[in-house]
């Protein structure tokens, strides 16, 4: 599990690559509040 925006699916990365898009470090994080601590 990852909630700090470091995670992006390979599928999304692949789609962006094939479409000529640029993968940036601003992926939307999963919802922090739905995780306990």
């Amino acid at each position: 599990a990852c909630d700090t925006a470091t995670c992006v699916t390979h599928r999304l990365a692949g789609l962006l690559s094939r479409s000529g898009g640029v993968v940036k470090n601003n992926f939307v994080p999963t919802n922090v509040g739905s995780k306990a601590f």
């Epitope: 599990a1 700090t4 470091t6 994080p29 509040g33």
Partner: antibody
């Protein structure tokens, strides 16, 4: 094994500042946000805020804005909390806690503010 | 901010007894944002239940959680001596995240 090792107890004078640390090990530091929680002696838990170590993004409880500053150091997998303009009301145990449903908390840092 | 009101504040139970602690929220929240913690005297808190009903790793099956909207509960099926602790609910629906004021569980 995941561990959160917090710095030792602090005795500081009113008006001073203090910076406490929370060293993480056993997991990828940048993959979980780190929460900070305050507990006064004999009282309940109060959420201060969290830091995202990946990009140093923070979210604060409005009550602690201007009092607490959260930072992190990816190279040492350490989260920090600095508390400023200390008063007796800041005397408490402060915990860091890793987000993720797996229940990892530091052992707590006891802060005593006294002249 | 969302205020979480726990009931009772303190209670004493006999070993084997069934215990229910309630947590009432001042605004409706989705169950995925409601968590329960246990804090034994002198120790850090630990998560018991996450997302209202999911048992955290290593937590005995006698603990369970339920609820929705503004009303949530934590149940201990059969009280044991090691369950003496303070229990807190916590919401992550809106910032600031907030905790209930705690329920102190003692043994008779």
């Amino acid at each position: 094994e995941v561990q959160l090792q917090q710095s030792g107890p602090e005795l500081v004078k009113p008006g001073a500042s203090v910076k406490m640390s929370c060293k993480a090990s056993g997991y990828t530091f940048t993959r979980s946000v780190m929460h900070w929680v305050k507990q006064k002696p004999g009282q309940g838990l109060e959420w201060i805020g969290y830091i995202n170590p990946y990009n140093d993004g923070t979210k604060y409880n409005e009550k602690f804005k201007g009092k607490a500053t959260l930072t992190s150091d990816k190279s040492s997998s350490t989260a920090y909390m600095e508390l400023s303009s200390l008063t007796s009301e800041d005397s408490a145990v402060y915990y860091c806690a890793k987000s993720g449903n797996d229940g990892y908390w530091g052992q707590g840092t006891t802060l005593t503010v006294s002249s | 901010e969302i205020v979480l009101t726990q009931s009772p504040t303190t209670m004493a139970a006999s070993p084997g007894e069934k215990i229910t602690i309630t947590c009432s929220a001042s605004s409706s929240i989705s169950s995925i944002y409601l968590h329960w913690y246990q804090q034994k005297p002198g120790f850090s808190p630990k998560v018991l239940i996450y997302r209202a009903k999911n048992l955290a790793s290593g937590v005995p099956a006698r603990f369970s959680g339920s609820g929705s909207g503004t009303s949530y509960s934590l149940t201990i099926g059969t009280m044991e001596a090691e369950d003496v602790a303070t229990y807190y609910c916590q919401q992550g629906s809106t910032i600031p995240f907030t905790f209930g004021s705690g329920t102190k569980l003692e043994i008779k």
